[in-house]
Amino acid sequence: MMCLECASAAAGGAEEEEADAERRRRRRGAQRGAGGSGCCGARGAGGAGVSAAGDEVQTLSGSVRRAPTGPPGTPGTPGCAATAKGPGAQQPKPASLGRGRGAAAAILSLGNVLNYLDRYTVAGVLLDIQQHFGVKDRGAGLLQSVFICSFMVAAPIFGYLGDRFNRKVILSCGIFFWSAVTFSSSFIPQQYFWLLALSRGLVGIGEASYSTIAPTIIGDLFTKNTRTLMLSVFYFAIPLGSGLGYITGSSVKQAAGDWHWALRVSPVLGMITGTLILILVPATKRGHADQLGDQLKARTSWLRDMKALIRNRSYVFSSLATSAVSFATGALGMWIPLYLHRAQVVQKTAETCNSPPCGAKDSLIFGAITCFTGFLGVVTGAGATRWCRLKTQRADPLVCAVGMLGSAIFICLIFVAAKSSIVGAYICIFVGETLLFSNWAITADILMYVVIPTRRATAVALQSFTSHLLGDAGSPYLIGFISDLIRQSTKDSPLWEFLSLGYALMLCPFVVVLGGMFFLATALFFVSDRARAEQQVNQLAMPPASVKV
């Protein structure tokens, strides 16, 4: 909407016009060979917005290094045009910009925490919901399916919208929407189970808008290692929000004496966060060099975007790898607590469970491990990638591949250890999950590198769709189905209950190895696909005319 260096708070149509005018002036200057422009200097030879300087500022319209001298710019000045001295003028950066972008990333990460907090608050009180509405297991499965399916269907739609319209407005509307729906769902009378199912579907739509669009804004605010760090913070929100969701669900229920109140916490926080996003998150233009933004929007159809993404081998392989991660996390999250409970029954350290919830203690421990390993994985992955980038250009997919293959080993060891030592099994889960989660932020970063900015929301959406479709939408059911199939051909005993589920879960490490292979395949094409994306950005940076959409 406007140049960040010049204004971090003001927004509106007038600034949009002025920024457009300035862009046109800058392009003419760039074509004449000018080195910089307005407050948003043109990129050097480093490639599409990728600068060697650690102090680089990612703006709406490109990247610029921090001005070493001179007074700070005037915050609140509407757009670059008002302050630019000419096509080649270099504008100093206001002191608040770094903080502004940091605040924007923090708010977006907070929104992601709330997204998952809301999702897992429901998980935390699911037994109470089941009890209250008289929901059978197939009904609980329906609630999960409705959520995931609506999320999957909505994600590509928001991807399309996110690449073409004001993203922060879509984000805020998404948060306001799911907050309102979740809050309303806490008042659904007992007889209207179908309304509860509908509300989960609507929440899935609201949350899809956030998961699809928010990472792309972070991608436009930062570059290189800073972007990796910020995406790490953003994706750490997943385990943090999930863990907090469980805690919020159970603690609010206990404090209020009624599970309904658990569903009223995240919506209130959601409304606040949605408002903060509207106020504090800059309405960034897509891409390091916003010169390409409007033109690309006008030129490419959704179908063309999809074709380009499907032809992008790094994107396709990393998406398939993400599906493998999703498959494993979905299946393990659902079945590991019960598997460990059955292991304890076999070891005679626990009683056979006749009345659910079975393995409640194991669920709690597993939840805590997931929360912590999520944090550790994201930090480890980001750190390893940062270090490996000094050695090789293929660092991102290679770190992911190593993480996946290492994870597969430890997931296999869970089933070996569980037979004799529950503590050993938990250690294997800890290491396995840490390695599995190490690729969360890196996968997002890979996408940012190999997909041009104006296709990123669509790319995130499509990746989200495929990872759910091929991953956690079906994996819990598939594992249960295989386990039941094995049990049907064996005698009914606690040992076979344990073994059948273990054999079924062995599918997970195989899928994870497959994911590792996909990351290795990504590594083969990563450098060329990244270069192609940068080349496209550079080509589109100087089109003949500006088109306003």
Epitope: K136, Q190, Q191, P356
Partner: antibody
């Protein structure tokens, strides 16, 4: 037509055991939640126990007054629900009704849409 | 546990009159209340579910209303077969509980 027929009642001494049985027909028993409700002579209705279907892991819920003494169970192959009553007390004297919960495939109502004719259990020394 | 209070314990009416039976819950229970009729020496039968939803085969003169803590069972123009005991039941939370009943008798 939905039918619920209770059997197994009678006169027993305090501290002894008794098992009530409820034979059902006219509906898909395996998908349906079942309960026992009792009524002491001249008194109101009191819910005793509930057993859910196999899709809810045949989970059982009990009233506080009988918890630990009574056990509800089901046999889907015979379309029967049982109430095993141990350590019977004088205050357990009542007519015991077998009841059905209305089923909606994905969920079930907690109210009772069909009742058996009831069976009398008398606990007296 | 949620306690249900029914009033009055006994209600004397003449056939053709319209009556309202009350049921009050000890806490808000939305619309999770159900009404049963028990004639002398018979099993109870379901009249109204979820405060106001009618049941197939039950005469239309029976209707229910209310939400939260206060609920009403209305009988429009009482007929001779309606003289019996009426119970309300809550299903908002376990344990499932019944009210003590209201006996409808001939005046």
């Amino acid at each position: 037509e939905v039918q619920l027929v209770e059997t197994g009642g009678g006169l027993v001494r305090p501290g002894s055991s008794l098992k009530l049985s409820c034979a059902t027909s006219g509906f898909t028993f395996s998908d349906t939640w079942m309960s026992w409700v009792r009524q002491a002579p001249g008194k109101g209705l009191e819910w005793v126990a509930l057993i859910k279907d196999k899709n809810s892991n045949s989970e059982a819920n009990y009233a506080e007054s009988i918890k630990g003494r009574f056990t509800i169970s089901r046999d889907d192959s015979k379309s029967r629900v049982y109430l095993q009553m141990n350590t019977l007390r004088d205050q357990d004297t009542a007519t015991y009704y077998c009841t059905r919960h209305e089923d909606f495939y994905y969920y079930s109502g907690y109210y009772f849409d069909y009742w058996g004719q009831g069976v009398m259990v008398t606990v007296s020394s | 546990d949620i306690v249900l209070t029914q009033s009055p314990p006994t209600l004397s009416v003449t056939p053709g009159e319209s009556v309202s039976l009350s049921c009050r819950a000890s806490q808000g229970i939305s619309t999770s209340i159900h009404w049963y009729q028990q004639r002398s020496n018979e099993s109870p039968r379901l009249l109204i579910k979820y405060a106001s939803q009618s049941i197939a085969g039950i005469p239309s003169r029976f209707s229910g209303s209310g939400s939260g803590t206060d609920f009403i069972l209305s009988i429009n123009r009482v007929e001779s077969e309606d003289f019996s005991v009426y119970y309300c039941q809550q299903t908002y939370s376990l344990p499932l509980t019944f009210g003590p009943g209201t006996k409808l008798e001939v005046k």
